[in-house]
Interface confidence: low
């Protein structure tokens, strides 16, 4: 609450996060033309990335384009991309939607469709929907430990959200354990009024707000965090503005002295930890 | 404008960026002692990295050191590094400029020059100039979509820079479309009075400032962002303070059971999105 | 100092860091059942990661699990994990401490111990102590160059911590060179009253605070940074809250068409650069 006689100072904050959990992923795997069910285990090294600062990312879904090599090939026949003759293809043209640079030739993509040939990582990425349900939907049960160290330099005061009295096997709950800093990802979504299973398909951004309203006067000292959660990406966003949260990354390798890559389009939840508040002192 | 009767509150912000574009790179490639022109395509997975938060990086140039292996070799003969006898080389010495630890022996680097032998990733990185013009100079035509969600917790007010009425095929222009949040990289530089082609060689840091000056009173409500651009690195910086923007990263692999790496010195533009402003309410 | 007649404005900041240094690492390497001493060199591409923003990470220690493959195997026999019959093992169970999903069978881990079989990356990670002393303890002698550009938009004032008059071969010292922005990592720890050699084993978080107290009035203009250092992680933290600073990442590769990975548990120092302060003008 506002105490007008106090000197207020904004918080200086440092955050450290640690995600825990294992996901079992079942997906169709094609090898040598044969498709079969593949089971694999994803642990933290597989679904999260060594990221600094006030964000962490948990991959909840993905689309893989394996064995790509730099060469010429027909581009993917998305809406409006088909051609019937070379006239439709412009040498040197880069369509922002395409994944390569046109050679000027119209070539067969499959038995029924022709598209412009491109210089690209081939075969080009298929523009298929993200798998539904999400492959790592069980990430809902992962937990994240959030450590937050704060400082009011003008008041020469430092504290942290984890106190020595706390129990490392707790789970945050708004009513029963509002000071526990281990959060189940599904609970974060529930608190924010969002459906994890749904968001996991396309990805999204979730804000974890840590509010420190600190009274540093010795006679009424109080300085503990309050956690709240809200979704930061726009779930009603128009397709042209790239809804959800995804990025592409590649694993490069050599096969028979040819550089190849596996392209992964990773969908997931980026969690932004937004720390704010003030310290007031007479 | 300052309304002294209002309660002002700083903005809490979350940013999400999405870069689009393809670059065609032409460079000399040496294989089996034969040098020929190589053409390759770089897409987002090749030139940018899955990075969190208020920054994104676009690689505009690079120098590769391929097939490095941990062993002993002569260090690179940069200025002042040549030797004529073992006396000039100090066992265990690590020159901050060097890439390894000296063994104490002076060995031939090539037919005309000798340098101190080092234990290092060999052959050591050649200290050659960044290619000019920059290999990915066409990154000037890449675009970035910036999504910014802001919150004034004290006023319980949230908004974002992208409105439902916006057109996903727009491009930001200071006069004609100042609310469009899709920016052409070259335009950002032009607005900041900088030359993209020049900066792309050594790299640099560009600030995209998003200023929210929000009047949250219902009778004169206004809350839209204003974008401005300024270069953040010092273009007149002394050589000793590492001008431009670059970092090294490695791709590791095994060949005949020997661990090897390709070292990439990546030059590029780091874009920092700096969100600031206040929300005022009676 | 507070000048009540001034209009104060918080600082907008951008940071760029550059770490320099080489570490020689000596460790036991086992190949074909034979253990011998291995020496390797780590340079910036090996011990740091291309990270944006106000943080950088220096790896000081690690534990490797090489040649892991997705299959079934006994889990690591940590405290409380041993079994004598299948009844102790629950099909589908994921122990948060474990690295896989139980199959329901109790199988031999070695000649004397049995543990529950899991579907996981196998062999599962051994839960051994971080090496002591730390493998990259010589990181104490690495240096970091910190470039900081600041802006007070309301006052239309920009400056940076590195001035043209500065000498690129300086090293920060609180008394002799308090404006030099090249810091020896060991000195940062000494200033903060911490022991680098000790922290390097488990990792930790170190804050580098840059305080700008700027008087922008022309008649008494002053705007230079003041550097201070403090440890941000809790060194007295209970085991359950994951003391120190570490994360796991993987290097994936194929061998005889089988996907494998090397898992690295990287311990190290995350340096957070915390920039704060105000610009005041009449």
């Amino acid at each position: 609450s506002d105490k007008l006689y106090q000197r207020k100072e904004p918080v200086i904050s440092s955050v450290h996060t640690k995600v825990k959990g294992i996901a079992e992923v079942t997906e169709n795997v094609t090898e040598g033309g044969v498709t079969k069910l593949g089971h694999s285990i994803f642990d933290t090294a597989d679904y999260t990335f060594p990221l600094q600062g006030n964000s962490f990312f948990v991959m909840t879904n993905y689309v893989k384009s394996e064995g790509q090599v730099q060469t010429l090939c027909p581009e993917y026949p998305r809406r409006g991309a088909q051609c019937s003759s070379d006239r439709r293809c412009k040498k040197g043209w880069m369509d922002p939607q395409s994944k390569g640079i046109q050679t000027g030739r119209c070539v067969p993509y499959d038995k029924t469709r022709k598209t412009c040939e491109v210089s690209a990582w081939c075969p080009t990425e298929e523009e298929k929907e993200a798998p539904r349900p999400a492959l790592l939907r069980s990430a809902e049960n992962f937990t994240v430990l959030i450590k937050n160290n704060i400082h009011f330099p003008g008041h020469n005061y430092t504290t942290r959200n984890i106190l020595p009295t706390m129990n490392g096997s707790c789970t945050f709950h708004k009513t029963w354990d509002p000071q526990c800093s281990i959060f189940r990802l599904g609970d974060i979504f529930q608190e924010a009024g969002e459906n994890f299973t749904e968001v996991a398909v396309q990805g999204g951004i979730m804000g974890i707000e840590i509010y420190w309203d600190c009274n540093l006067d010795s006679w009424s000292h109080h300085c503990r965090p309050r956690y709240s959660f809200r979704r930061l990406d726009d779930k009603n966003m128009d397709e042209s503005f790239v809804p959800g949260y995804n990025f592409r990354y590649a694993k490069y390798y050599k096969e028979n002295n040819v550089e190849k890559r596996t392209l992964i389009k990773a969908f997931g939840i980026r969690f932004d930890i937004l720390v704010f508040g003030t310290g007031g002192k007479f | 404008s300052d309304k002294l009767y209002q309660r002002k509150e700083p903005v809490i912000s979350s940013v999400h960026t999405k870069v689009k574009g393809i670059a065609e790179v032409t460079e000399n490639v040496t294989e089996g002692g034969v040098t020929k022109l190589g053409h390759s395509i770089f897409d987002t997975a090749d030139y940018t990295f899955p990075l969190q938060g208020n920054s994104f990086f676009v690689m505009t140039n690079y120098v590769k050191s391929e097939g490095q292996v941990q062993t002993l070799c002569p260090e690179y003969p940069r200025r002042g590094a040549q030797c004529s006898s073992d006396r000039r080389c100090k066992k265990g010495w690590m020159d901050p400029q060097s890439k390894g630890i000296q063994t104490g022996r002076c060995v031939p680097y090539d037919k005309t020059r000798k340098t101190c032998e080092v234990s290092a990733w060999c052959p050591t990185e050649e200290e050659k100039e960044a290619p000019r013009p920059a290999l990915l100079r066409s990154a000037e035509n890449f675009t970035v979509l910036i999504k910014n969600n802001i919150h004034f917790p004290g006023h319980n007010y949230t908004t974002r820079n992208i409105l439902p009425t916006m057109n996903g095929s727009c491009t930001f222009h200071k006069t004609w479309d100042p609310q469009c949040s899709i920016f052409r990289l070259g335009d950002i530089f032009q607005e900041a009075g900088e030359n993209f082609t020049e900066v792309a060689v050594q790299g640099g840091i560009m600030g995209i400032e998003i200023y929210w000056d929000c009047n949250l009173d219902s009778w004169s409500h206004h809350c839209r962002p204003r974008y401005s651009f300024r270069r953040l690195d010092d273009k007149n910086m002394d050589e000793s303070f590492v001008p431009g923007y670059n970092f090294r990263y490695a791709k590791y692999y095994k060949e005949n059971n020997v661990e090897k790496r390709t070292l990439i010195k990546a030059f590029g533009i780091r874009f920092d999105i700096l969100v600031f402003g206040t929300g005022g309410k009676f | 100092s507070d000048k009540l007649y001034q209009r104060k404005e918080p600082v907008i900041s951008s940071v760029h860091t550059k770490v320099k240094g080489i570490a020689e690492v000596t460790e036991n390497v086992t190949e074909g059942g034979v253990t011998k001493l291995g020496h390797s060199i780590f340079d910036t591409a090996d011990y740091t990661f291309p990270l944006q923003g106000n943080s950088f990470f220096v790896m000081t220690n690690y534990v490797k699990s090489e040649g892991q493959v997705q299959t079934l195997c006994p889990e690591y026999p940590r405290r409380g994990a041993q079994c004598s019959s299948d009844r102790r093992c629950k099909k589908g169970w994921m122990d948060p401490q474990s690295k896989g999903i139980q199959t329901g069978r109790c199988v031999p881990y070695d000649k004397t111990r049995k543990t529950c079989e899991v579907s996981a990356w196998c062999p599962t990670e051994e839960e051994k102590e971080a090496p002591r002393p730390a493998l990259l303890r010589s990181a104490e002698n690495f240096t970091v160059l910190i470039k900081n550009n600041i802006h007070f938009p309301g006052h239309n004032y920009t400056t940076r911590n590195i001035l043209p008059t500065m000498n690129g071969s300086c090293t920060f010292h609180k008394t002799w060179d308090p404006q030099c922005s090249i810091f020896r990592l060991g000195d940062i720890f000494q200033e903060a009253g911490e022991n680098f050699t000790e922290v390097a084993v488990q990792g930790g978080i170190m804050g580098i605070e840059i305080y700008w107290d700027c008087n922008l009035d022309s008649w008494s203009h002053h705007c230079r940074p003041r550097y201070s250092f403090r440890r941000l992680d809790d060194k007295n933290m209970d085991e359950s809250f994951v003391p120190g600073y570490n994360f796991r990442y993987a290097k994936y590769y194929k061998e005889n068409n089988v996907e494998k990975r090397t898992l690295i548990k990287a311990f190290g120092i995350r340096f957070d650069i915390l920039v704060f302060g105000t610009g005041g003008k009449f």
Epitope: E24, T26, H39, P133, R137, S138, E140, N141, R184, G186, D187, Q190, T197 | - | K91, G92, W93, M94, I101
Partner: nanobody
Framework: KVQLVESGGGLVQAGGSLRLSCAAS????????MGWFRQAPGKLREFVAS????????RYIDSVEGRFTISRDNTKNTLYLQMNNLRAEDTAVYYC????????????????????YGQGTQVTVSS
Amino acid sequence: KVQLVESGGGLVQAGGSLRLSCAASGRTVSDYGMGWFRQAPGKLREFVASINWSGIYTRYIDSVEGRFTISRDNTKNTLYLQMNNLRAEDTAVYYCAYFLGPNWYSNYGRPSSYDFYGQGTQVTVSS
């Protein structure tokens, strides 16, 4: 709204077998864990068996482990419970439910983690 319809109950002698089915309509339940619960006269509803969304993992109450087998056919949106070697104490109304969470691995046996829509099917085991 999901509708769950149980079938396959009946009167059987001790040591006999029954196969219960639960057909889901209204939406696909293949994304959810599913479970069987039972309620004997004058007793609370109790967990019997549960299966995760993929059908790979199953859980049972100790008293039915080895005698009952839960399975599902996601293509048919159907859940099954094969009950062998039935005992008198298995007499109850059996309900099919789908798991809403949180955390199937920890909470598969907690009735409050499920949504119940079925009317139930009576199983009576005579001795």
